[in-house]
């Protein structure tokens, strides 16, 4: 029986240009975490599987960096970033927990570069 | 348990438009995952045609890209199919599935076989 | 797009012989492969999932390994409802593409 829940940032929202740590948490569960997957709906950010450590996709490769922890992070952010983030946490014996932040990636903001009156 | 079944006309005359429905009972296609349709020609294998997500934004294969189209009706809990132009190699059996996370289809249509004649 | 080479295209093997089949992809997907079991007449059937987690209900003779371009679908022993046509799938990115299919037959 899978008892785990996971624990996620939930909605995020970051300025262009800048970096955004992607984090969940299994906790409720004594299940072994084997392997977690970031992922979006259409493409896989980055896998860490215990046994052969992290692969980052080579789409990503420049703005991705591992960690911290099982989390990810997110540089040079762009307005094309927004969107639904997945973490997918294979664990032993209890199966698949799936996880999901949205990030909102906003220009920056108006109190920096807004018209002042 | 979640179930899916396409239906639509098993003839379709060449040039014309292909279009199938698979109604989707035991889950909400708003609620969560990606719903997709992948064919299967007759004795050939598999290809992943596209998907309609929960949200509604749709993914194709770039293959077929210029000719698809997957859309949804919420009320009725159904996603479509409408492929253009259609020629003798779209002659295939047609599944809907559901893509879980990660991208695997645990959940499919039985499949609806469309042959494409004049 | 990634493409999904298996080998062999067709196996002829005993009940309670040990089955292997390959699928080779074009370039590195680290573990996002899954495998499929296809009958006569039915939809394709989901066996294993990211290189090698078994999917619910799946008997424990199908076992997957492998990762960056080279997987492996075994069956320990061989029964024989296991005749079928076997696929493999990359999860990676769109477009999925499937492997071109292994037919499993009982000798």
């Known amino acids: 029986m899978m008892t785990g829940t996971i624990e996620t940032t939930g909605n995020i929202s970051a300025e262009k240009g800048g970096s955004i740590i992607l984090q969940c948490h299994l906790s409720s569960t004594t299940a072994q975490v084997t392997q977690v997957n970031w992922e979006q709906q259409d493409q896989l950010l980055a896998i860490c599987n215990a046994d052969l450590g992290w692969h980052i996709s080579p789409s990503f490769k420049d703005r991705v960096a591992p960690g911290p922890g099982l989390g990810l992070t997110l540089q040079s952010l762009t307005v094309n970033d927004t969107g639904e983030y997945f973490c997918i946490y294979h664990t032993y014996p209890d199966g698949t927990y799936t996880g999901r932040i949205f990030l909102e990636v906003l220009e920056s903001s108006v109190a920096e570069h807004g018209a002042r009156f | 348990d979640v179930q899916l079944q396409e239906s639509g006309p098993g003839l379709v005359k060449p040039s014309q438009t292909l279009s199938l429905t698979c109604t989707v009972t035991g889950y909400s296609i708003t609620s969560d995952y990606a719903w997709n349709w992948i064919r299967q020609p007759p004795g050939k294998g598999l290809e992943w045609m596209g998907y309609?997500?929960?949200?509604?934004?749709?993914r194709y294969n770039p293959s077929l890209k210029s000719r698809i189209t997957i859309s949804r009706d919420t009320s009725m809990n159904q996603f479509s199919l409408k492929l253009n132009s259609v020629t003798a190699e779209d002659t295939a059996t047609y599944y809907c599935?559901?893509?879980?996370?990660?991208?695997?289809?645990?959940?499919w249509g039985q499949g609806t076989l469309v042959t494409v004649s004049s | 797009d990634i493409q999904m080479t298996q080998s062999p295209s067709s196996l002829s093997a005993s009940v309670g012989d040990r089955v292997s089949i390959t699928c080779k992809a074009s370039?590195?997907?680290?573990?996002?492969v899954a495998w499929y079991q296809q009958k006569p007449g039915q939809a394709p059937r989901l066996l294993i999932y990211?290189?090698?987690y078994r999917y619910t209900g799946v008997p424990d003779r199908f076992s997957g390994s492998g990762s960056g371009t080279d997987f492996t679908l075994t069956i320990s022993s061989l029964q024989a409802e296991d005749v079928a046509v076997y696929y493999c799938?990359?999860?990676?990115?769109?477009?999925?593409?499937f492997g071109q299919g292994t037919k499993l037959e009982i000798k």
């Open positions: 370039q590195d997907v680290s573990t996002a």
């Open positions: 309609i997500s929960y949200s509604g934004s749709a």
């Open positions: 799938q990359h999860h990676y990115s769109t477009p999925y593409t």
């Open positions: 990211s290189a090698s």
């Open positions: 599935a559901r893509k879980g996370y990660p991208a695997y289809f645990a959940y």
